[in-house]
């Protein structure tokens, strides 16, 4: 998220970006770090019980713009944030689940945090 008054000039990002990975580490990762030519991400989604589960890791450059756009999927509660500004930048991301729409309560009181939806970082 850009703070007020922060420069919008593009910054050179590393050709190879290292990201924290959690529940989403490739086999060759060491110490929960993966490498990518694209983006680091952190994602939160609900499992079948309604438990929020965070995963984080690396997204390749190809297609990552689309994945980071976080298009809402009906009946799937999830949110993703992406970053590229420095190595391991995704440990500072904090995606939160979108608020329930009233009709979602029809299915019963599933647990989730009632935060505002966050957008991805570039």
């Amino acid at each position: 998220k850009k703070e007020d008054g922060e420069s919008t000039a593009p910054t050179a990002r590393p050709k190879v970006l290292r990201c924290k990975c959690h529940h989403h580490c490739p086999e060759d990762s060491v110490n929960n770090i993966c490498s990518t030519d694209g983006y680091c991400f952190t994602m939160i989604e609900e499992d079948d019980s309604g438990t929020p589960v965070v995963t984080s890791g690396c997204l390749g450059l190809e297609g990552s713009d689309f994945q980071c756009r976080d298009t809402p999927i009906p009946h799937q509660r999830r949110s993703i944030e992406c970053c590229t500004e420095r190595n391991e930048c995704n440990k500072d991301l904090h995606p939160t689940l979108p608020p329930l729409k009233d009709r979602d309560f029809v299915d019963g009181p599933i647990h989730h945090k009632h935060h505002h939806h966050h957008h991805h970082h570039h």
Partner: antibody, heavy 119, light 107 residues
């Protein structure tokens, strides 16, 4: 008032099974989740998992998958923790704890059940 | 899973002292941190939720603050009945993890 009353202490042998109950009163049982937390002697707190009291769907932390099961008797406002094939390292106090809708802090805790596993 | 590093492990205090306990999270938790008090032989009790909100009936000498990865719990004026172990907990993502605890003891 709001209470979570757990079953009494258990002394078991390795390989046996134990079932702990947690009876809720003073609130609508199905509008709060029921969590289970382990505290080994002299140690800290470890979240084991929870059960969605509305849907009945449980979710376990990775360290508690396999031998541990969460269940409900909704008509009796009671949650259960079942531990199969008990091991010495299961010796601990087990707490049930209520979590409010949309949040994962635990606002009401059970009385605790001490399970001792010894041959 | 996410680690909550709690310091110190022990605190020797006198009645009237101001006490500060810290928890450092391994990941950005936003405001999603709670603090509990556990007296010997008792169940834990919720004191603070959402980093800084006092739970119902909790005296105002207990306060919490912080955001992201750094969280602080303060007792402004310690009383004898505050002797207990205090735990932080992240309630952002499963598995919900606790700090290792801070034991408050009288000098």
């Amino acid at each position: 008032q709001i209470q979570l009353v757990q079953s009494g202490p258990e002394l078991k042998k390795p390989g046996e099974t134990v079932k702990i109950s947690c009876k809720a009163s003073g609130y609508t049982f199905t509008t709060y989740g029921m969590n289970w937390v382990k505290q080994a002697p002299g140690k800290g707190l470890k979240w084991m998992g929870w059960i969605n009291t509305y849907s009945g769907v449980p979710s376990s932390a990775d360290d508690f998958k396999g031998r541990f099961a969460f269940s409900l008797e909704t008509s009796a406002s009671t949650a259960y923790l079942l531990i199969n094939n008990l091991k010495n390292e299961d010796t601990a106090t087990y707490f049930c704890a209520r979590s409010e809708l949309r949040n994962w802090y635990f606002d009401v805790w059970g009385t605790g059940t001490t399970v001792t596993v010894s041959s | 899973s996410f680690v909550m590093t709690q310091t110190p492990k022990f605190l020797l205090v006198s009645a009237g002292d101001r006490v500060t306990i810290t928890c450092k999270a391994s990941q950005n938790m936003g405001h999603d941190v709670a603090w509990y008090q556990q007296k010997p032989g008792q169940s834990p009790k919720l004191l603070i939720y959402s980093a800084s909100n006092r739970y119902t009936g909790v005296p105002d000498r207990f306060t919490g603050s912080g955001y992201g990865t750094d969280f602080t719990f303060t007792i402004s004026t310690v009383q004898a009945e505050d002797l207990a172990v205090y735990f932080c907990q992240q309630d952002y993502s499963s598995p919900f993890t606790f700090g290792s605890g801070t034991k408050l003891e009288m000098k």
